[in-house]
């Protein structure tokens, strides 16, 4: 899994009439990092993982840095021709990696309310765009706004390329980044559904990386993908991840069913709990 | 222009609280953190804190953290800090400086501060 | 905190010279080292930057450089009206914190 730094800036308008503020939030290795708006950022998560590993760093040159981006992409927004009333947003999404090989990868992607409408290829500077009419319309306008400057662009995307991987090896040097694994709290609950139907929830928390299996097995079996119905992989806010999958089965039969984790190597099966006991938490280490 | 126009000299008394101030122009007020630094007769300079007028969040050097509160009044552009408990040791000339990512681009003409019985 | 030494305490020079002011951090700072120039009895006026940025209004004599924990302050050609203190000051780590400071002297 490659170390990655990801900035994700948003700009809004009015009436046509673009805001003053912006928000630009960054992630290392898919945690949510620093939080920027106006001349302030701040290191995110605060809990105690970025107490231990992020110190009492101000933060100056990526609060300078950041703020410019977020200028830049204000004026970018002002370049969109026929926008129409209330309120819209334009973002901006940079990511870089660094895979095991040392190999790089940068990206750069613009949406418009949402919807992704021009990408590039830091690195080769090849530019994409979906087929829709609007997204079309949107890049070219973009883009034209970008060209005008063509040497000031040229070098501003080099520049982001080059910065966001050297930003991304300061922080793997200094130790911001730390190659940990927490392994998952896990709970399997269930639930009273109707006709003689249970509904099993299995809930893993805590785990870091974000990378985990979690499945249903029918006497060892894993069930099919149609039957099981999975949340999303979600920070927690403590540097460590959230899950859960789930899958109705009928009442009686819970001793067939176990809920399978697998996490960094590791893996272990969880039983359904009998009807009298709500939870049954299990920790591996 | 920018300009930063602080309160005149004080003389307090040991234990008497004081309250200094840094009025705000030529600049938008609410969009940038405002500095305070303290200077001894004959010495350095030492950071004691910034605030950041559009919401009050402030930042304060521990050695100061029961010594001065930072405040402002956004509708005079207007800046304060309060000195609790004054000591001699507080006797020094105090700027407030207005902040550029971490650097005091523009400062006040200082205010002098003599604890004295 | 961060401390920040300043050598030598004080530098004098002759009109015309040229002088270089020196700042030591006590851990990795990056880039984030300002300078300031205080004349007797005013208040401090930023020279430069991060390192080696320069600041509108500021003569072109004066330039920055260093990265790290090393750090230099350059008047290319002093002239009499450089007589002042000049203290570094670093934004890395709270608390802000600033150098003891370098007296400037005319011989």
């Known amino acids: 899994e490659p170390h990655s730094l990801r900035y994700n800036l948003t700009v809004l308008s009015w009436d046509g009439s673009v805001q003053s503020g912006f928000l630009t939030e960054v992630h290392l290795d898919g945690q949510p990092f620093l939080r920027c708006d106006r001349q302030k950022c701040r290191a995110k998560p605060q809990g105690q993982w970025a107490e231990d590993v992020l110190g009492n760093k101000t933060w100056d040159r990526e609060t300078r840095d950041l703020t410019g981006n977020g200028k830049d992409l204000r004026m970018t927004l002002a370049h969109i021709k026929d926008q129409k009333e209330g309120l819209h947003s334009l973002q901006e999404i940079r990511v870089c990696e660094i895979h095991e090989d040392n190999s790089t990868r940068s990206s750069q992607h613009f949406y418009y309310d949402g919807e992704l409408f021009l990408s590039q290829n830091l690195e080769t500077k090849e530019w994409t765009m979906p087929q829709s009419s609007r997204a079309q319309t949107l890049a070219m306008n973009v883009r034209n706004f970008l060209k005008e400057d063509a040497m000031k662009t040229k070098t501003h995307y080099h520049a982001m390329h080059a910065d966001c991987l050297q930003e991304l090896r300061r922080y793997l040097k200094s130790g911001v980044v730390l190659r940990r694994t927490v392994p998952p709290m896990v709970n399997v609950t269930r639930s009273e559904a109707s006709e003689g139907n249970i509904t099993v929830t299995c809930r893993a928390s805590g785990f870091y990386p974000w990378n985990i299996t979690l499945s249903w097995r029918q006497d060892g079996v894993s069930l099919s993908h149609d039957t099981q119905q999975w949340g999303d992989v979600l920070p927690d806010g403590n540097g460590t991840y959230q899950t859960w999958v789930a899958t109705r089965i009928c009442q009686g039969e819970e001793q067939r069913f176990t809920c399978y984790m697998e996490h960094s190597g590791n893996h272990s099966t969880h039983p359904v709990p009998s009807g009298k006991v709500l939870v049954l938490q299990s920790h591996w280490q | 222009q920018v300009q930063l126009q602080q309160s005149g000299a004080d003389l307090v008394r040991p234990g008497a609280s004081v309250r200094l101030s840094c009025r705000a122009s030529?600049?938008?007020?609410?969009?940038?953190?405002m500095n305070w630094v303290k200077q001894r007769p004959g010495q350095g300079l030492e950071w004691i804190g910034m605030?950041?007028?559009?919401?009050?969040?402030?930042r304060l050097n521990q050695k100061f953290k029961d010594k001065a509160t930072l405040t402002v009044d956004k509708s005079s552009n207007t800046a304060y800090m309060q000195l609790s408990s004054p000591t001699s040791e507080d006797s020094a000339i105090y700027y407030c400086?207005?902040?550029?990512?971490?650097?005091?681009?523009?400062w006040g003409q200082g205010t002098s501060v003599t604890v004295s019985s | 905190d961060i401390l920040l030494t300043q050598s030598p305490a004080i530098l004098s020079v002759s009109p015309g010279e040229r002088v270089s002011f020196s700042c030591r951090a006590s851990?990795?700072?990056?880039?984030?080292i300002h300078w300031y120039q205080q004349s007797t009895n005013g208040s401090p006026r930023l020279l430069i930057k991060?390192?080696?940025e320069s600041i509108s209004g500021i003569p072109s004599r004066f330039s920055g450089s260093g990265s790290g924990t090393d750090f230099t302050l350059t008047i290319n050609s002093v002239e009499s009206e450089d007589v002042a203190d000049y203290y570094c000051?670093?934004?890395?780590?709270?608390?802000?914190?600033f150098g003891a400071g370098t007296k400037l002297e005319l011989k």
């Open positions: 991060y390192a080696s």
């Open positions: 030529g600049y938008s007020f609410t969009n940038y953190w």
């Open positions: 605030i950041h007028p559009s919401d009050s969040e402030t």
């Open positions: 400086a207005r902040d550029d990512f971490f650097t005091m681009d523009y």
């Open positions: 851990q990795n700072i990056v880039t984030s």
């Open positions: 000051q670093q934004s890395n780590i709270w608390p802000l914190t």
